[in-house]
């Protein structure tokens, strides 16, 4: 807000005696007056003591009229230098200056810490013009004063491309001990050394600092802030503070605990997300890391059949994100699994075991020794073959797919057959004369279609031959076997 | 009482040159800036600048920067503005105004205003 | 530059009425900011400034209110010699800048 009293008003003993200074009389170079910019800040009515003159920051612009009047040397007047008050009171102050009305132009500005206060609510402006004179008061109130409040503050006059600055204003704002550094929570390792920090400042200063461990004072003389509590170990959790002291009382900061490290609890909760005919996804809740970040954990499987040998398979894993995917696992198997994760204190114990099975999966061998003879009598084609190794099944077997393609001058055609898991034999119709006849079989479980073994060919004559013999898997190295007979 | 008085109207022919003056009386001339202000026909206002009657020293709009020129007569009280190279848009009516205060810049007092018109 | 934008340009209103004017400041003015009345073939009156002062002599039915960038003219009981075009005018920075006015007229 600014306040503007008109003529009538003639507030002048505010200001009495002449301007401050003595008149120029030398004729100086005329000095371009430009136009000012800044801003004029909002004012309040607020009158303040008559003092002497300030004859420390007096301008004395270098301007002349186009008669070669000199201008007056301009000043503020001299105010309270230092105010000392209590957090959260209100505080005013001013600067005032009378300024000569031929100076025509001019703007008044608050700053703090060398930065302009711009647009501040609580600076207010008053001035009392006359014919000759205008008076100008700028005050700046703060309702309830803070610490950040702290600091210098002058008025600034901008005229003829000039400043005028006041004498700065020292506020200082006195409460409790405001902390800047409190202890922080950690967590230590047992019956080792560690420090905690705490620092408070006033005003007003000293600000001096006592321990306080399980509410009992650590230091029985205090440390002037900042203070370094060094702790020689603990066995036990504990809970610190500090206590700031001032002239103006006491400030306790937080409590904080400070931890000892331990192994961690058991991961709980292992529970099976997935799986597969050879693999398990897992995943686990982590127990209480033992005021310790976990490092990794360890997944622990044993096969769950009484006749297994007992082996432990171990895989290795970071800790999170508490999933993993155990891999060459048998199909159609039942294992126990548990998990284990460490810090850097040591393992936990290994968690409740679980059970867990795999699925079936598609055979991963083809059936073995398939050969394959032409009955010529019965116009048939015989085909045997041995099951694959049991282990290599990956399931229970419910039966075979026979794939037999038939060529013959250029024509090509596959038939399939599927064949019951008990037999180890088949036999399909001859398709076509005078052509060849290519064999493959696969084990089939509930998993899925296994391999096809290799090719098997065999020669099928026209009507009226007689001979015949059997055609067979080739030994390894062998390309495509074909028997003509 | 406090009165600014400017010269009668004017007509001009395009770029010619026009010259306004505003006597000040009831007042210390030398301690209120003078400003002057147009107004073309039924428009707003237009600030063209201001001169300190103290210094001497002008200061203008950035429009008129090169066209406009104040000077003062201090023995007489009078502040003149002459706008050269006229157009058809310079035909409106000129203010004098003066300066409220040294901290304000906002016009208490004005002429009763000059019509220049201009017509070849 | 610091533009002033008035609303309405316009303004239709009988005695008696309740009028409000407003003025927005292209940036912040803080409350420098003032408002003139002018009637047909007159110059500008001054009315009010530092945003919410009235000049000598203005009849307290005019009141100014705002500060940043928002203003208000309010005439709380139109005046048949209150018809005329009204401007407001920055001044916290230069070069000094009016809006476009706004032309109450009778309705």
């Known amino acids: 807000a600014i306040t503007e009293a008109r003529e009538e008003a003639k507030p002048y003993p505010l200001f009495p005696g002449p301007f401050p200074g003595s008149l120029q009389t030398d004729h100086t170079p005329l000095l371009s007056l430009p136009h000012a910019s800044g801003y004029q800040p909002a004012l309040m009515f607020s009158p303040t003591q008559p003092g002497r003159p300030h004859t420390g920051n007096v301008a004395i612009p270098q301007v002349t009229s186009v008669e070669s009047k000199p201008l007056p040397p301009l000043a503020f007047k001299h105010t309270v230098g230092h105010i000392i008050l209590s957090e959260h009171k209100g505080v005013k102050f001013n600067c005032s200056i009378s300024v000569p009305n031929i100076y025509q132009d001019t703007t008044i500005s608050w700053w703090k810490d060398g930065k302009e206060l711009l647009g501040a609510h609580h600076a207010i402006t008053q001035f009392y013009p006359d014919d000759e004179v205008t008076a100008i008061i700028a005050s700046f109130s703060i309702t309830s004063v803070q610490r950040s409040d702290n600091g210098s503050y002058i008025c600034k006059m901008k005229i003829n491309n000039e400043e005028i600055v006041s004498d700065p204003i020292y506020i200082e704002v006195q409460g409790l001990p405001h902390f800047t550094k409190q202890p922080e929570s950690m967590n230590v390792t047992r019956n080792t050394a560690f420090n905690l920090t705490c620092q408070a400042v006033g005003p007003p200063e000293p600000v001096n600092i006592f321990w306080v461990q399980n509410s009992s004072r650590v230091n029985e003389q205090p440390e002037k802030s900042p203070s370094v509590l060094t702790v020689p170990g603990l066995t036990e959790m504990a809970v610190f503070s500090c206590e700031a002291h001032n002239d103006k009382g006491l400030t306790v900061s937080k409590g904080v605990q400070i931890n000892i490290k331990a192994i961690p609890s058991p991961p709980t909760e292992v529970s099976i997300r997935n799986s597969t005919a050879h693999s398990i996804l897992i995943s686990w809740v982590p127990g209480f890391d033992g005021y310790s970040p976990f490092r990794n954990c360890s997944i622990q499987v044993k096969e769950a059949d009484p006749l297994s040998n007992g082996s432990v398979m171990i895989f290795n894993t970071s800790a999170l994100p508490h999933l993993y995917q155990i891999k060459q696992l048998q199909a159609l198997a039942n294992y126990s699994i548990g998990v284990s994760c460490m810090n850097e204190i040591g393992w936990s114990a290994v968690s409740p075991w679980i059970l867990a099975s795999t699925t079936e999966g598609a055979p991963s061998v083809a059936p073995l020794n398939v050969t394959v003879f032409l009955n010529e009598s019965s116009d048939n084609v015989d085909i045997r073959w041995m099951k694959p190794p049991t282990k290599q099944q990956d399931g229970e077997l419910v039966g075979y797919r026979i794939s037999h393609v038939w060529q013959s001058a250029g024509i090509s055609k596959e038939l399939l057959e599927e064949v019951g898991q008990n037999g180890s034999r088949a036999r399909i119709s001859v398709q076509v004369h005078n052509a060849t006849c290519t064999v493959r079989i696969a084990a089939v479980t509930r998993g899925g279609v296994g391999p096809f073994s290799d090719p098997v060919k065999i020669f099928i004559p026209a009507h009226g031959w007689v001979d015949y013999a059997p055609s067979s898997t080739p030994a390894p190295g062998n390309a495509d076997p074909v028997l003509i007979i | 009482q406090v009165q600014l008085v400017q010269s009668g109207a004017e007509v001009k022919k395009p770029g010619a040159s026009v010259k306004v003056s505003c006597k000040a009386s009831?007042?210390?001339?030398?301690?209120?800036?003078m400003n002057w202000v147009r107004q073309a026909p039924g428009q707003g206002l237009e600030w063209m600048g201001w001169i300190n009657t103290y210094t001497g020293e002008p200061t203008y709009a950035d429009d008129f920067k090169g066209r406009v020129t104040f000077t003062l007569d201090t023995s007489t009280s009078t502040a003149y503005m002459e706008l050269r190279s006229l157009r058809s848009d310079d035909m409106a009516v000129y203010y004098c105004?003066?300066?409220?205060?040294?901290?304000?810049?906002?016009?208490?007092?004005w002429g009763q205003g000059t019509t220049v018109t201009v017509s070849s | 530059d610091i533009q002033m934008t008035q609303s309405p340009s316009f303004l239709s209103a009988s005695v008696g009425d309740r009028v409000t004017i407003t003025c927005k400041a292209s940036?912040?003015?803080?409350?420098?900011v003032t408002w003139y009345q002018q009637k047909p073939g007159k110059a500008p009156k001054l009315l009010i400034y530092w945003a919410s002062t009235r000049h000598t002599g203005v009849p307290d039915r005019f009141s100014g209110s705002g500060s940043g960038t928002d203003f208000t003219l309010t005439i709380s009981s139109l005046q048949p010699e209150d018809f005329a075009t009204y401007y407001c005018?920055?001044?916290?920075?230069?070069?000094?800048?009016f809006g476009q006015g706004t032309k109450l007229e009778i309705k």
């Open positions: 005018q920055q001044y916290r920075s230069y070069p000094l800048t």
């Open positions: 105004a003066r300066k409220s205060t040294v901290v304000s810049r906002y016009f208490d007092v």
């Open positions: 009831g007042y210390t001339f030398t301690n209120y800036g």
């Open positions: 940036q912040d003015v803080g409350d420098a």
